[in-house]
Interface confidence: low
């Protein structure tokens, strides 16, 4: 999905009002310096691409974040403010339903959510210069 045509300001507002708080809740009990940020993004469409990937794609050691509160709110924001996004997610959602598992917060998931926090912060500062 190409995130170029999303309403970035509306997504930013959704992040600031609620998603950011859910991410902090998920990370409660971990130090802010515990994980190094190894994922970055260069502009807002790129940031949303990476946010979607880390939020909804299963990875080794962290099977699924998609049922977390921040993920459901992220999905809702993208569906509302990115034209055509919800249609592209139908197949992905059906696949998710088939492999729903017991929720376990692993260290790998905490690391992944830490990366997500960094991506969201970058999304909110699109004019920062990057090497």
């Amino acid at each position: 999905y190409d995130f170029t045509n999303c309403d970035f300001e509306k997504i930013k507002a959704a992040y600031l009002s609620t998603i950011s708080k859910d991410l902090i809740t998920y990370m409660s009990g971990t130090k802010s310096t515990e994980f190094n940020n190894t994922v970055s993004c260069s502009n807002r469409p790129h940031c949303l691409t990476e946010i979607q990937s880390l939020t909804f794609n299963p990875t080794a050691g962290c099977a699924s974040l998609a049922k977390e509160m921040f993920a459901m709110k992220t999905k809702a924001a993208l569906a509302i403010w990115c034209p055509g996004y919800s249609e592209t997610q139908i197949n992905a959602t059906q696949a998710m339903k088939k492999r729903r598992k017991r929720k376990v917060t692993t260290n790998k998931c905490l690391e992944q959510v830490s990366q997500l926090q960094g991506l969201w912060r970058r999304f909110n500062r699109p004019l920062l210069k990057q090497q």
């Epitope: 994980f35 993004c41 502009n43």
Partner: antibody, heavy 118, light 108 residues
Framework: EVQLVESGGGLVQPGGSLRLSCSVS????????VNWVRQAPGKGLEWLGA???????NYHSALISRLTISKDNSKSTVYLQMNSLRAEDTAVYYC????????????WGQGTLVTVSS | EIVLTQSPGTLSLSPGERATLSCSAS???????LHWYQQKPGQAPRLLIY???NLASGVPDRFSGSGSGTDFTLTISRLEPEDFAVYYC?????????FGQGTKLEIK
């Protein structure tokens, strides 16, 4: 069919500059990024930088002062400008198309050889 | 900057044998950002495996990838003559990309 074709390589004097072109087909530069990667003779791959659909760029931190990546969407061409060339810049220069904004390079050009020598 | 170190530098095996190539990252990586390429002399690199374990289009299923954190592996279950080449691991989320130094797989 996605294709990338590099051109502009050749012999360059030390201290000189190069401007390479990457002509693309099968996709639009308005929406897709292109990366540059080089390979010195007998050596490994080195990422140089990227230009994205919206025109934003990223560069290898060690080369940022000597490197400029630009594009002309209407000509479906991406350019790599590199200044103050030295012998160690001798390499085959490739352009590559990433999958979306990822670092997954599924499509590569054939490469163009740049030799820096007096 | 994340540094990728590949081992061994050269691997000498015979057709039919199993090859195991390693890639170690200087700090922990999401498995979404680790990819493998094959390169033969005089050719551009070819994408083999993306996001740690997914086979690229047209790649035979004797190739597989695994790993997490800092340690990743490319395995070729049964070597064919055309598999002898240089293999590179690569990391990056599209910016600040780095490659390993490569592993040369040669015929014993």
């Amino acid at each position: 069919e996605v294709q990338l074709v590099e051109s502009g390589g050749g012999l360059v004097q030390p201290g000189g500059s190069l401007r390479l072109s990457c002509s693309v087909s099968g996709f639009s530069l308005t929406y897709s990024g292109v990366n540059w990667v080089r390979q010195a003779p007998g050596k490994g791959l080195e990422w140089l930088g990227a230009i994205w659909g919206d025109g934003s760029t990223n560069y290898h931190s060690a080369l940022i002062s000597r490197l400029t990546i630009s594009k002309d969407n209407s000509k479906s061409t991406v350019y790599l400008q590199m200044n103050s060339l030295r012998a160690e810049d001798t390499a085959v220069y490739y352009c590559a198309k990433p999958d979306g904004y990822s670092g997954i390079f599924a499509y590569w050009g054939q490469g163009t050889l740049v030799t820096v020598s007096s | 900057e994340i540094v990728l170190t590949q081992s061994p530098g050269t691997l000498s095996l015979s057709p039919g044998e199993r090859a195991t190539l390693s890639c170690s990252a200087s700090s922990s990586l999401s498995s979404n950002y680790l990819h493998w390429y094959q390169q033969k002399p005089g050719q551009a690199p070819r994408l083999l495996i993306y996001r740690t374990s997914n086979l690229a289009s047209g790649v035979p299923d004797r190739f597989s990838g695994s790993g997490s954190g800092t340690d990743f592996t490319l395995t070729i279950s049964r070597l064919e003559p055309e598999d002898f080449a240089v293999y590179y691991c690569q990391q990056g989320s599209g910016i600040l990309v780095t490659f390993g130094q490569g592993t040369k797989l040669e015929i014993k």
